[in-house]
């Protein structure tokens, strides 16, 4: 008789999840010499240990500490790019501007990017059918707690000028409920971080409006200023040209603001 299985509202664990995590780890450590010492089997064991046999609504940051320890990585603290609701462009940017890093350019972010996972209480099985949805089921699920943990650590490590890419095509350019708004903003360290510089990315349509004047950006400025961090904001009116100019900064059309 098949055992009753909890039905959650979100999609189940990504197929071939263990193999994907292990393969990504191997690939990452091959590409990044400074992480060559990492034992990917140990990384997978620690990852698995964070959620296997545990109720997928009772995961804590503590559960991920062994994985965090194994994935400890030093990135230049003054070269951090945060993003909110505009992941693809942020990643395209760091692929070109190789000395800057998003969370997904670190080992732990790279391992988990775009993946879903969860287990079941008291069984060693991975649930490939469904996993808890953050809104409909519970916030302390394996995926949400993972990203909260790594995002907090990433923000805590930042220093000097921190950049954040924000999506100007959203109704809330800055959203207090996003990972950036709820975790990263509050974990930037005022004694280390001098300035948060927001890049507001305009959508495909041409526009001359200054989205740095948007009320949600003013709200972000207020939050940041209260934390004794300076705030600045730039419009990226043409993201395609912005990327092109990152690739070819000497191009004559790249002298003006983009």
């Amino acid at each position: 008789v098949p055992r009753w299985r909890q039905q959650w509202s979100g999609p189940g664990t990504t197929k071939r999840f263990p193999e994907t995590v292990l393969a990504r780890c191997v690939k990452y450590t091959e590409i990044h010499p400074e992480m060559r010492h990492v034992d990917c089997q140990s990384v997978w064991d620690a990852f698995k240990g964070a959620f296997i046999s545990k109720h997928p609504c009772n995961i804590t940051e503590e559960d991920y500490q062994p994985l965090m320890k194994l994935g400890t990585q030093t990135v230049p603290c003054n070269k951090i790019l945060l993003w909110s609701r505009i992941k693809d462009l942020a990643h395209q940017f760091t692929q070109v501007q190789r000395d800057m890093f998003t969370l997904e350019d670190t080992l732990l972010g790279y391992l988990a990017d775009d993946l879903t996972w969860c287990g079941e209480f008291n069984t060693s099985k991975i649930n490939y059918q469904s996993c808890p949805d953050w809104r409909k089921d519970c916030s302390n699920n394996p995926v949400s707690v993972f990203w909260k943990t790594v995002s907090r650590r990433f923000a805590e490590a930042a220093c000097d000028v921190v950049h954040v890419m924000l999506n100007g095509s959203r109704s809330k350019i800055f959203d207090k409920n996003s990972t950036f708004g709820s975790v990263e903003v509050h974990n930037l360290q005022p004694e280390k971080v001098q300035t948060l510089e927001a890049w507001v990315i305009h959508g495909g349509r041409e526009d001359s409006r200054d989205l740095c004047q948007d009320p949600t950006i003013k709200e972000l400025e207020s939050i940041i200023s209260k934390r004794n961090i300076q705030f600045s904001c730039k419009n990226i009116y043409r993201p395609d040209k912005f990327l092109q100019c990152v690739k070819n900064p000497e191009d004559s059309s790249c002298t003006s603001e983009i």
Epitope: R170, S171, R205, E206, D207, S208, D214, N235, Y237, I258
Partner: antibody, heavy 118, light 112 residues
């Protein structure tokens, strides 16, 4: 062909409010800013503010931001402009105008006369 | 706010003759995205304004080629190569480089 059809003329008392509507014929209504521009009798044009219906982003001219409310109903492709605390100097023709290209008002409604008189 | 100043206030032109209207802005209209958002509208008697020229020199669809625009920075010109009777009305320059969008005071074109 883009058409903007506005509501009819209104006569209002000082201190009251008026709400003017503007119905668009176009399927691109949600993704184009809709502006409101007014013209007092014998005077020039004055931009009041605009809205991007699909995400509800609104910009107001500083002169109007305390008294004007711009809204849009995507389901009916209709934009609205409500002006409160009316005074005699608000007597004007109020136009809605839709972008043809980014930040360029290419299509205009026929105008709605709002007369404010005691 | 950016102030747009038009000259002359009015002009009277014989059909077939050229006409020129000037527009000056209180600050540069060159936007940081590389565009200059200076436009020209015509408001014919009893009608709504209609777009003639956008971004300094681009004719809007259906606008006759006798209308042309030029200029940069803060100084702009609308030219009508050969005025026709249907060109009467008030011409407005407008900027949308900086919020709030602003309009010139208008230039009234009459036929002699």
């Amino acid at each position: 062909q883009v058409q903007l059809v506005q509501s009819g003329a209104e006569v209002k008392k000082p201190g009251s409010s008026v709400k003017v509507s503007c119905k668009a014929s176009s399927e691109v209504f949600p993704t184009s800013y809709m502006s409101w521009v007014r013209q007092a009798p014998g005077q020039g044009l004055e931009w009041m503010g605009d809205i991007l219906p699909n995400i509800g982003r609104i910009f107001y001219g500083e002169k109007f931001e305390d008294r004007v409310t711009i809204t849009a109903d995507k389901s009916t492709s209709t934009a609205y402009m409500e002006l409160s605390s009316l005074r005699s100097e608000d007597t004007a023709v109020y136009y809605c105008a839709r972008e043809a290209y980014g930040s360029i008002l290419g299509y205009w409604g026929q105008g709605t006369l709002v007369a404010v008189s005691a | 706010d950016i102030v747009m100043t038009q000259t002359p206030l009015s002009l009277s032109v014989t059909p077939g003759q050229p006409a020129s209207i000037s527009c000056r802005s209180s600050q540069s209209l060159l936007h940081s995205n590389g565009n200059t958002y200076l436009h020209w509208y015509l408001q014919k008697p009893g009608q709504s304004p209609q777009l003639l020229i956008y971004k300094v020199s681009n004719r809007f669809s259906g606008v006759p080629d006798r209308f042309s625009g030029s200029g940069s920075g803060t100084d702009f010109t609308l030219k009508i190569s050969r005025v026709e009777a249907e060109d009467v009305g008030v011409y407005y320059c407008s900027q949308s480089s900086h919020l709030p969008w602003t309009f010139g005071g208008g230039t009234k074109l009459e036929i002699k």
